[in-house]
C-alpha cells in the first residue's frame, strides 16, 4: 500500500473537519468519514489543494475512519487514523 | 486460504483461520472479513477486522462472533459460537478495501451436526 | 436491504442480459457487482456502480445511482454461467442482494 497521510488543517473544530489527505502518486477522486462508534459513511466535499472538508450539524466523534477512492481507480479504507484529540496542523500516517 | 473443521456439534464453537498470501495484513488499508453462504441461499457478511484489533461485527451475529489477527503469522481468525443447524454454510475470507471485497479466499464448508 | 431480480434468467449465447438491484434506502453510487460460479470465490466485476474491476471483460458494465442499480452483460457468453450478487457498501453492515441466476439456454 503507497504511503499516505492526512493532514488536520486549520479551521477543523468539534463541528467542522478539514483534512488534507496525500496518497503517494496519485490524487484523491472521493475521500468518505466514519465517526467513532458510526455504521455510516458519510462523503467529504473536495477544496482546493486536495483538502477535504465535512460539516456536521452535532459534534464531530473521533478516532476518525477513512476511505478513498483515488484517481487511478485506488481504493482503500483506514480506520482511526485521525486521533478524538487532534491537533491542528499534525499529520497523521496509518499505523504500521 | 481458509482452513478449520469441517463438521462441528450443536452448542460447540465454529474456528476458522485464514491465512494471507502476496501482502502483508500489518501494513494496513484493508479490512479482513468473512462471509458465509447456507446452502441454497445468499451471501451473508459477518463482520471484517482491521490489522489494529479493530472490529466490526454484523448485528444479527454480533454476540456469537470473535474475529482475531495475527500479523506476526499473517493470518486472521473467526470464532462462532453456540452453533446450530443454521450456521451450516460456506465460509469465505476476503479482503475488503472499504467499498468492496476485492480478493476472496476459496472457501470451506462447515456443517454443523451431531 | 437489497432486491434483485430477476431472480434467475435463461438467455442464449450473444444476448443482452441486465439484472436490476433496488436498494430501500439511498446509498449513493457505493454498488458492487460480484459473479459467483459453483466451487470458485466470488469474483468482483463492478464498484461505484459503474466502475469496471481490473481485468473483468468490457461486456460487463454497472449504472445507477441512489436506490436503482443495474447490471448489464452486452452479449452473454458461456462463461457467464452463474450467480450475480449486488452488495452496498454506504453503511455497516455490508449486505449483499439475494442474487440472480444466469443461464445460457
Known amino acids: 500500500v503507497p504511503k499516505v497521510t492526512f493532514t488536520v488543517e486549520k479551521g477543523s473544530n468539534e463541528k467542522h473537519l478539514a483534512v488534507l489527505v496525500k496518497y503517494e502518486g496519485d490524487t484523491m477522486a472521493e475521500v468518505e468519514l466514519r465517526e467513532h462508534g458510526s455504521d455510516e459513511w458519510v462523503a467529504m466535499t473536495k477544496g482546493e489543494g486536495g483538502v477535504w472538508t465535512f460539516d456536521s450539524e452535532e459534534p464531530l466523534q473521533g478516532p476518525f475512519n477513512f476511505r478513498f477512492l483515488t484517481e487511478k481507480g485506488m481504493k482503500n479504507v483506514f480506520d482511526d487514523v485521525v486521533p478524538e484529540k487532534y491537533t491542528i496542523g499534525a499529520t497523521y500516517a496509518p499505523e504500521e | 486460504l481458509e482452513s478449520g473443521p469441517g463438521l462441528v456439534k450443536p452448542s460447540q464453537t465454529l474456528s476458522l483461520t485464514c491465512t494471507v498470501s502476496?501482502?502483508?495484513?500489518?501494513?494496513?488499508?484493508?479490512?479482513w472479513s468473512w462471509i458465509r453462504q447456507p446452502p441454497g441461499k445468499g451471501l451473508e457478511w459477518i463482520g471484517y477486522?482491521?490489522?489494529?484489533?479493530?472490529?466490526y461485527y454484523n448485528p444479527s451475529l454480533k454476540s456469537r462472533v470473535t474475529m482475531s489477527v495475527d500479523t506476526s503469522k499473517n493470518h486472521f481468525s473467526l470464532r462462532l459460537s453456540s452453533v446450530t443447524a443454521a450456521d451450516t454454510a460456506v465460509y469465505y475470507c476476503?479482503?475488503?478495501?472499504?467499498?468492496?471485497?476485492?480478493?476472496w479466499g476459496q472457501g470451506t464448508l462447515v456443517t454443523v451436526s451431531s | 436491504e437489497l432486491t434483485q431480480s430477476p431472480s434467475s434468467v435463461s438467455a442464449s449465447v450473444g444476448d443482452r442480459v441486465t439484472i436490476t438491484c433496488r436498494a430501500s434506502?439511498?446509498?449513493?453510487?457505493?454498488l458492487a457487482w460480484y459473479q459467483h460460479q459453483p466451487g470458485k470465490a466470488p469474483k468482483l466485476l463492478i464498484y461505484?456502480?459503474?466502475s469496471l474491476q481490473s481485468g473483468v471483460p468490457s461486456r460487463f458494465s454497472g449504472s445507477g445511482y441512489g436506490t436503482d442499480f443495474s447490471l448489464t452483460i452486452s452479449s452473454l457468453q458461456f462463461e457467464d454461467s452463474a450467480t450475480y450478487y449486488c452488495?452496498?457498501?454506504?453503511?455497516?453492515?455490508?449486505?449483499f442482494g439475494q442474487g440472480t441466476k444466469v443461464e445460457i439456454k
Open positions: 452488495q452496498q457498501a454506504n453503511s455497516f453492515p455490508y449486505t
Open positions: 434506502q439511498g446509498i449513493s453510487s457505493w
Open positions: 476476503a479482503r475488503s478495501d472499504g467499498y468492496t471485497l476485492d480478493n
Open positions: 477486522i482491521y490489522h489494529s484489533g479493530n472490529t
Open positions: 461505484s456502480a459503474s
Open positions: 502476496g501482502g502483508s495484513i500489518r501494513s494496513g488499508g484493508y479490512y
